[in-house]
């Protein structure tokens, strides 16, 4: 018989309360861990990294710290006002080598549009990435870096989820070993040549991403070559065997009827905790319905919702959700009509998703207004159309030769939103800022060996 | 097929006036702008006017304001530039073009276009 692989990269997952208070409720919270978890999953299982196969990735744990833990002098993000740098510190700080990765998700829109920072894995001989256990390091402080942090909020918005998606999985990138893309053959955004310009950028290009271009959720072939050697190295030393769901971390997987954590972190009257016996644990309790963490449409006293209760809100491109009385999941919305306007104006509704640009809506594709002399810097903030497939019609949708269109109103793109051909992101004044891939991580790593440069934070 | 077709143009004193007529098929003219841009030998194609066909608004350039006019008449598929008060400046060929989404001056955003008409005005 065959030894079956160690594929699977177990995740610990953290939440601090700024991201409990802008999703709501635990149940919120855990839905986006787990679209977050499957969206790599699905990246990383279908990427060969050079033999290597079918990587995939399990929340062996999960925290999530409330609102209520704001106060707590225990839970170490609590500080409101934090870098990025010492945000991944925090994190660090902790011991965490039960698990392959440790991340911890947030709301906090921090300098220069960085969206996230980890610690790069490599062959060997140095600190950082996937299965690196906690040891001492100079600044006289025990750390993990097998670490990272990903914010869902940049420049004062929020980042569409397939963004944040792509964020996670460019930070686990780092972990895995891969720097950033460079080079012609890795960086095809960056292209003179249309037809490669066109497919976009990959994974780990080092600025902005829109998430809707065909290499935006792709590996190139230079991060595969480095993930690939980290992978041969270092994979033994803490991956493990795919197959059986863990109890425990909150997700409802197969095999388990429900999960509501264990006993410290289960509020659930309807669910045995993972504390319990082998028999018993993540299954209902008698007589039970359903368990609230199985889906919105449970209620806490282990019933299905009624027909007609509300279990989604209304969004730009889709109907609000309705529970149907027999599910505790949230059925899926109905899709407003392609092509309705919404991201305030700057974008249209495609197959119930807000996806394709406002341009799109007049047979135009959306572009960068960018001059080559750098003279019209003020106008790489407004949303650009151009014909298809000809960047010599590229114009601002306040431009004449858009008012067909756009009357003469200039649309802005929203803050937050790629410019500069993904060269930065726009902020609140509507400039663009160039992005600063490479800086965080390097402070971070000069703190480390000397701790002087580091303040401490005050609470 | 897109056909545009110019006409009108000729020879003319300073001073006079001359209407050209830009005659148009193949395409749904309510759905396009049309614009008149001329060219005069060494120099770029510049735009003149243009007008859009669902709403009729128009642009024009500030060198021809207030002395050129364009109009379309849509049951007869055709586009009208009125020139008053010419100037020796105004010696051009002038050509006519149509796009589905564009407006403006900028002839890199019009797709078809006319042969031309020579325009020349004498001092």
């Known amino acids: 018989t065959t030894s079956a692989e160690k594929n699977t990269c177990q995740l610990y997952i953290q939440t601090d309360h700024l991201f409990f208070k802008y999703y709501g409720t635990r149940e919120a919270v855990i839905a986006q861990i787990s679209s977050h978890v499957k969206a790599i999953d699905t990246i990383y299982q279908t990427t060969d990294f050079s033999g290597i196969r079918n990587i995939s990735f399990m929340v062996k744990r999960i925290r999530i710290n409330t609102t209520a833990d704001e106060k707590d002098p225990t839970n170490p993000f609590r500080f409101p006002n934090i870098g990025v740098e010492k945000f991944l510190e925090l994190n660090s700080e902790q011991n965490h080598d039960d698990y392959c990765l440790a991340y911890v998700f947030t709301d906090r829109d921090f300098d220069d549009g960085v969206l996230g920072l980890a610690w790069v894995g490599a062959p060997s001989g140095s600190s950082g990435g996937i299965c690196e256990k906690s040891k001492l390091y100079s600044d006289g402080k025990k750390k993990s870096l097998n670490t990272g942090i990903i914010t869902v909020q940049n420049y004062g918005s929020h980042v569409p989820p397939k963004v944040s998606h792509i964020t996670f999985a460019h930070e686990v990138g780092h972990n895995f070993g891969s720097p950033h893309d460079s080079g012609t053959e890795c960086t095809p955004g960056e292209s003179k040549n249309l037809g490669q310009k066109e497919n976009g950028n990959y994974i780990m290009y080092a600025r902005a991403t829109s998430g809707d271009k065909l290499n935006n959720n792709k590996f190139s072939l230079c991060s595969i070559r480095n993930i690939s050697q980290v992978l041969e190295k270092k994979r033994n030393n803490c991956f493990v065997e795919s197959g059986q769901p863990i109890c425990g971390n909150g997700m409802v997987e197969q095999g388990e009827e429900c999960d509501c954590g264990y006993s410290d972190q289960c509020k659930d009257e309807c669910c045995f905790d993972a504390n319990q016996p082998e028999g018993r644990k993540c299954k209902l309790k008698p007589g039970k319905q359903c368990s609230p963490s199985q889906g919105p449409c449970c209620t806490a006293q282990c019933a299905f919702k009624s027909k007609s209760e509300k279990c989604r809100d209304d969004s730009d491109c889709a109907r609000e959700g309705i529970c149907n009385g027999f599910t505790a999941l949230c059925p899926a919305s109905d899709p407003k009509p392609n092509f309705t306007d919404c991201n305030r104006h700057t974008q249209v509704c495609i197959n119930g998703q807000c996806a394709g640009s406002i341009c799109e809506k007049y047979g135009l594709e959306e572009c960068t207004c960018a001059s080559s002399d750098g003279k019209d810097d003020k106008e790489l903030c407004h949303v650009c159309c151009m014909k298809k497939m000809d960047p010599s019609t590229c114009a601002s949708t306040g431009s004449v030769q858009w008012s067909r269109h756009f009357s003469g109103r200039t649309i802005t793109l929203q803050p937050g939103s790629p410019c500069n051909d993904f060269r930065g992101y726009c902020d609140v004044f509507m400039r663009c800022r160039l992005v600063d891939a490479d800086g965080p991580l390097a402070r971070l790593k000069k703190a480390i060996f000397s701790p002087e440069l580091y303040e401490n934070i005050a609470e | 097929e897109v056909q545009l077709v110019e006409s009108g143009g000729g020879l003319v004193q300073a001073g006079g006036s001359l209407r050209l007529s830009c005659a148009a098929s193949g395409f749904t003219f309510d759905d396009y702008a049309i614009g008149w841009f001329r060219q005069a030998p060494g120099k770029e194609r510049e735009g003149v006017s243009c007008i859009s066909m669902s709403d009729g608004s128009t642009y024009y350039a500030d060198s021809v304001k207030g002395r050129f006019t364009i109009s379309s008449d849509n049951a007869k598929n055709t586009v009208y530039l009125q020139m008053n008060s010419l100037k020796p400046e105004d010696t051009a060929v002038y050509y006519c073009?149509?796009?589905?989404?564009?407006?403006?001056?900028?002839?890199?955003?019009?797709?078809?276009w006319g042969q031309g008409t020579q325009v020349t005005v004498s001092s």
């Open positions: 073009a149509a796009d589905r989404l564009a407006f403006g001056l900028d002839s890199n955003f019009y797709d078809y």
